[in-house]
Interface confidence: low
């Protein structure tokens, strides 16, 4: 004499935040009335308490204060249950308990899911591309569940599965992040589309990125110019050095060489259709028109600014063509620094004083140390402050304050971080009189 | 400059593992691609593998996989292998080595395990 | 794997020779994409792989033009002009086209 009790038997599929009805119901015989019934769900696995009916009356929720019972329906055998705002850690089997006279259960599950968002692709490296590079493609893609399928594929639509790594990460609430990452070897040009699917939704969420390098893959013009970066004083000329490869039999005719700003693109001097078109920036530019034919694309920065710093790109386009981007470094030496003291007479062993030293149009930022007499670093109670002017040159004012000792000399070295240049000075205190030190 | 530095000498007993580390100063970490590779003495290089930090994204050549793990830890721009189970075939000099799209353009100094009872 | 073979050993050279150096790959470096990666590194005692040549023939930067690459598929060539001291040690060629990476025995280039 068991009651039946009936339930969905495949799983019921919730998308997270929103209601979700668990089904169950049961046949009621003539003459039944709500106080025979005792109606119990609980989790199928922990037997942990959901939401009960007994006595006739709604026990309530046991569950976070999310469920509800139908109560209108309740007497013609509807037991379902409302989830209300479901959660990814609700996913799992419920089990539907009636008993009247005799008892039944059945088990429903809870599939709960979540919609990946539309992927984000990025490339790594994601400039200067060329045919052979190895580029790093991530795609990612927010807040699904389940755990996504992802599939790769080139233009043709040719799955790529070597050199694929995909990540999964859940976050607080549970639901995951995806990053996936392919790393290729370019080929002239690509498409390579990335597909996250739901499994449980069927959805799928798919994003794209075309390729293409800047040259074909033979053939390109080799442009050199210096790894490191050029380094020149504030108001002195500076050679930015390229060179290319020319050819037997090539001619400046067949020559077009732009020197360009690197970020902005900004153009800063051209050489086209056999003669030099002159410099676009603001007329400090030139370049080495006798050595053009051997391959020297140098330029010759006049007058360097601190404006200037940055990054300039070389290309060159004969047939094929080829670039390369060598960095600018503007250096000015700071002045010898000059050292003031506050108070500066009436001085006694005990006294708080303030040292300033102060050095002058220098680039760039410099660093400051300051040391006594034996040589040991002070580096208490400095503050350091630098400041550009309008042509961008720093001067910088460092301010010690010390408690004087019996007598004492304490020194302040300005550095030059590029130029490796030290300027110092130096103040020595003995109780009274207080004297500087000559100049050098 | 680019500069690849390694962790010291180690003496390890058979069976033991050890982690070696390679410390990497005025580039991109995140962006570049670290490989390790091998060296026995007098004998020819052998690539064991190489780590993307960005994602952590791991190649080992199958000779490699589960002897060797690779990771990295971008806030000190420094890179890890850690290598399981030693035998006196592990002794060797261990190289750290930037992969700079095609080639092998600056490399460590090379960190030297010795595996002995 | 790719097996990449260096004859011989061994290259006894007397300073201002010129040294020929040879590679040879088990199957062709020729990628899909046409690029042939092919690279010399030179190791001198005590120290670590200096690259000198990339993909064949590619100076990388630095490296004096007495040293010169040449080949196509399966065999490739490195030549030294006119040897100096510093160029003693042992050179090693490298294929990047075919996952994993590997390198050759390496030659020792030597005083005879």
């Known amino acids: 004499g068991a009651l039946e009790v009936q339930v969905p038997e495949d799983p019921v599929v919730a998308l997270v935040g929103t209601d979700a009805t668990l089904c169950c119901s049961f046949s009621p015989e003539p003459g039944f009335s709500l106080a025979q019934l005792n109606l119990i769900w609980q989790l199928t696995d922990t037997k942990q308490l959901v939401h009960s009916f007994a006595e006739g009356q709604d026990q309530g929720s046991a569950y976070a204060n999310r469920t509800a019972l139908f109560p209108d329906l309740l007497a013609q055998g509807n037991a379902s249950l409302r989830l209300q705002r479901v959660r990814v850690a609700d996913e799992g089997s419920f089990t539907c308990f009636v008993s009247i006279r005799d008892f039944g259960s059945a088990a429903v599950s809870l599939q709960v899911a979540a919609p990946y968002s539309k992927p984000s692709m990025t490339l790594e490296p994601n400039k200067d591309l060329r045919p052979g590079d190895t580029v790093t493609i991530t795609c990612s893609s927010y807040q699904g569940y389940p755990e996504a399928e992802v599939f790769w594929q080139d233009g043709q639509g040719v799955p790529l599965t070597g050199n694929v790594t995909t990540s999964q990460m859940a976050n607080e609430q549970g639901l995951f992040d995806v990053h996936s990452i392919l790393r290729v070897v370019l080929g002239a040009n690509g498409t390579y589309s990335c597909l996250v699917r739901n499994p449980v939704l069927q959805q799928d969420a798919h994003s794209s990125v075309t390729i293409t390098p800047q040259r074909s893959p033979t053939g390109a013009v080799e442009v050199q110019v210096p790894e490191d970066p050029v380094v020149a004083l504030v108001g002195t000329d500076a050679t930015l050095r390229c060179s290319f490869s020319p050819e037997p039999g090539f001619s400046l005719a067949q020559l077009n060489l732009i020197w360009q700003l690197t970020d902005t693109k900004q153009l800063v001097h051209s050489f086209t259709e056999g003669r030099d078109q002159g410099s676009a920036y603001a007329n400090r530019t030139a370049l080495f028109p006798d050595l053009l034919a051997q391959g020297n694309a140098s330029l010759r920065l006049q007058r360097v600014r601190v404006a200037d710093e940055g990054s300039f790109t070389c290309f060159v386009s004969i047939r094929d063509f080829g670039s390369a981007a060598v960095s600018l470094q503007v250096a000015a030496p700071y002045s010898k620094p000059s050292m003031t003291l506050e108070p500066n007479k009436d001085l006694r062993p005990g006294d708080t004083v303030t040292i300033t030293c102060s050095s002058y149009r220098g680039y760039p930022e410099a660093e400051v140390f300051w040391q006594d007499g034996q040589g040991v670093p002070l580096t208490g109670n400095v503050t350091t402050s630098q400041m550009a002017n309008e042509q961008g040159l720093f001067d910088v004012h460092s301010v010690l304050r010390v408690v004087l000792g019996a007598n004492g000399t304490y020194s302040c070295l300005v550095r030059n971080p590029v130029l490796q240049q030290d300027a110092h000075g130096s103040v020595t205190i003995t109780g009274q009189p207080m004297t500087f030190p000559p100049e050098a | 400059e680019v500069q690849v530095v390694e962790s010291g000498p180690e003496l390890v007993k058979p069976g033991a593992s050890v982690k070696m580390s390679c410390k990497t100063s005025?580039?991109?970490?995140?962006?570049?691609?670290l490989s390790w590779v091998k060296q026995r003495t007098g004998q020819g290089l052998e690539w064991i593998g190489e780590?993307?930090?960005?994602?952590?994204?791991?190649h080992y050549n199958g000779k490699f996989k589960g002897k060797a793990t690779l990771t990295a830890d971008k806030s000190s721009n420094t890179a890890f292998m850690h290598f399981s189970s030693l035998t006196s075939e592990d002794s060797a000099v261990y190289f750290c080595a930037r992969w700079n799209n095609f080639f092998f353009d600056y490399w460590g100094q090379g960190s030297t395990l010795t595996v002995s009872s | 794997d790719i097996v990449m073979t260096q004859p011989p050993l061994s290259l006894p050279v007397t300073l201002g020779d010129l040294a020929s150096i040879s590679c040879r790959s088990s199957q062709s470096l020729v990628h899909s994409n046409g690029i042939t990666y092919l690279h010399w590194y030179l190791q001198k005692p005590g120290q670590s792989p200096k690259l000198l040549i990339y993909?064949?023939?590619n100076r990388f930067s630095g490296v004096p033009d007495r040293f010169s690459g040449s080949g196509s598929g399966t065999d490739f060539t490195l030549k030294i002009s006119r040897v100096e001291a510093e160029d003693l040690g042992v050179y090693f060629c490298?294929?990047?086209?075919?996952?994993?990476?590997?390198f050759g025995g390496g030659t020792k280039l030597e005083l005879k």
């Open positions: 993909k064949v023939s």
């Open positions: 780590i993307y930090p960005r994602g952590n994204v791991t």
């Open positions: 490298s294929q990047s086209t075919h996952f994993p990476w590997t």
């Open positions: 005025a580039y991109t970490f995140s962006d570049s691609v």
